[in-house]
């Protein structure tokens, strides 16, 4: 602790805001929970800090961070999933703030794959489906879905839909004709987990078919 | 002020069933592992089973592992123990126990099970 | 599962100090945190050490826990005894899905 005051790092860390934000991802990597961790300033000098979670463990008490440039990081099988851990922050052996926290309750999802559209000439709509990994998990299965969707002209112009399962059907009179159309989701934990919303996946553009004159109906691509 | 309040105790003949309740206030419930722990008459503290916040994570001693189920209601701030196949050396005095700060930080007043014929 | 052995009496006078050990069977003391529960006669457990060595508040600070890894044992050491502090003390330690508590030691001030 001496050796970090002498040079009067230990001072100046303690006026500075150490407030961080944490996401775990449960089985991530076959049976590997991982944790990220990080600051919520930016500005933060990160040189000599480090992070330490301690409780709700298998078979050890504490374990340290892997520092991955501005992010915290740990993959590990021993998060016990029960109960609060204590996640520090760390010079020395000093802590500089704490926070108690229960990894099931900041879920974040791994982001939705393969999204795609297909358009069914004869239904007039469009089945919307995408996967999740999440199907194969233990733990974490049920999850809500955020599928978002625009015109590509319409920069902030989005409809979102909520839906639990992986399909979706859009309704091509809802959609304007002849028109490029964006569409991607995204997933939160929906049962038994709390947390966050996952990355969005790639976003998938299709195109609307143009209306058929003597039919009203639109044609397909 | 936390206060856990154990109820549904009382004597069963052997390879009947119980189930006690545990009413819980004075915190945020749905917040808390929680957690039943047994005290035979004149002897130590076993611990039974846990139940996590969401309901999900649960786990038991192998004492009772497949004749007792733990659940809870957190609409209604409530602990539940599931009894079957009740023996005669289940016959304890069961606390129901909240997990905070540390692993036990409440407990309540205990509720007793007496197993005989 | 390991076992958690604890002695099942101790004895000290008024002022004196006592040390209740806590062996673990298998497996490291280090894996996971202990903690230490006193039992009065005829009431609940209450916790007077969590994670090895903290203090809840409001337990005065004659009681303190340490771990001995070359012994692989936890102790409760009660310092300046009191008539108040007679009663049953438990050591408890989970692995990575039970919990699991010494058999408990009783504790009589003369």
């Known amino acids: 602790e001496s050796g970090y005051a002498q040079n009067g790092d230990l001072e100046d860390a303690e006026l500075d805001d150490y407030s961080f934000s944490c996401y775990s991802q449960l089985e991530v990597n076959g049976s590997q929970h991982s944790l990220t961790c990080a600051f919520e300033d930016p500005d933060v000098n990160i040189t000599n800090l480090e992070f330490e979670i301690c409780g709700a463990l298998v078979e050890v008490k504490c374990l340290n961070f892997r520092k991955l440039q501005e992010i915290y990081f740990i993959e590990t099988k021993k998060f016990l999933l029960i109960g609060k851990s204590n996640i520090c922050v760390k010079v020395g052996e000093k802590s500089l703030t704490c926070k108690k926290i229960d990894l099931t309750t900041i879920v974040k999802p791994e982001a939705p794959f393969d999204l795609s559209v297909v358009y069914r000439e004869g239904a007039n709509d469009f089945v919307v489906t995408f996967n999740t990994s999440h199907l194969q998990k233990k733990y974490v299965k049920v999850l809500m879905h955020d599928v978002a969707y625009r015109q590509e002209k319409d920069e902030n112009k989005w409809t979102h839909v909520n839906l639990s399962s992986t399909k979706l059907t859009l309704l091509q009179r809802k959609l304007q004709p002849a028109a490029m159309y964006e569409i991607k989701v995204r997933s939160i934990p929906d049962h038994y987990f709390k947390g966050f919303w996952s990355e969005w996946s790639p976003s998938y553009y299709f195109r609307t078919p143009e209306i058929n004159n003597s039919s009203g109906e639109m044609d397909p691509i | 002020q936390v206060n856990l309040r154990e109820s549904g105790g009382g004597l069963v003949k052997p390879g009947g069933s119980l189930r006690l309740s545990c009413a819980a206030s004075g915190f945020t419930f749905d917040d808390s592992v929680m957690h039943w722990v047994r005290q035979a008459p004149g002897k130590g503290l076993e611990w039974l089973s846990l139940v996590g916040w969401d309901g999900f994570f649960t786990y038991y001693a192998d004492s009772v592992k497949g004749r007792f189920t733990i659940s809870r209601d957190n609409t209604k701030n409530l602990l539940y123990l599931q009894m079957n196949s009740l023996r005669a050396e289940d016959t304890a005095v069961y606390y129901c126990?909240?997990?905070?700060?540390?692993?036990?930080?409440?407990w309540g007043q205990g509720t007793l099970v007496t197993v005989s014929s | 599962n390991f076992m958690l052995t604890q002695p099942h009496s101790v004895s000290g006078s008024p002022g004196k100090t006592v040390t209740i050990s806590c062996t673990r069977s298998?497996?490291?003391?280090?894996?996971?945190?202990v903690q230490w529960y006193q039992q009065r006669p005829g009431n609940s457990p209450t916790t007077v050490i969590y994670e090895d060595d903290q203090r809840p508040s409001g337990v005065p600070d004659r009681f303190s826990g340490s771990i001995d890894s070359s012994s692989n044992s936890a102790s409760l050491t009660i310092s300046g005894l009191v008539t108040e502090d007679e009663a049953d003390y438990y050591c408890m330690q989970y692995d990575s899905s039970h919990l699991v508590f010494g058999g408990g030691t009783k504790l009589t001030v003369l």
């Open positions: 126990a909240r997990q905070g700060d540390y692993v036990f930080n409440n």
């Open positions: 298998s497996g490291s003391i280090d894996s996971s945190y």
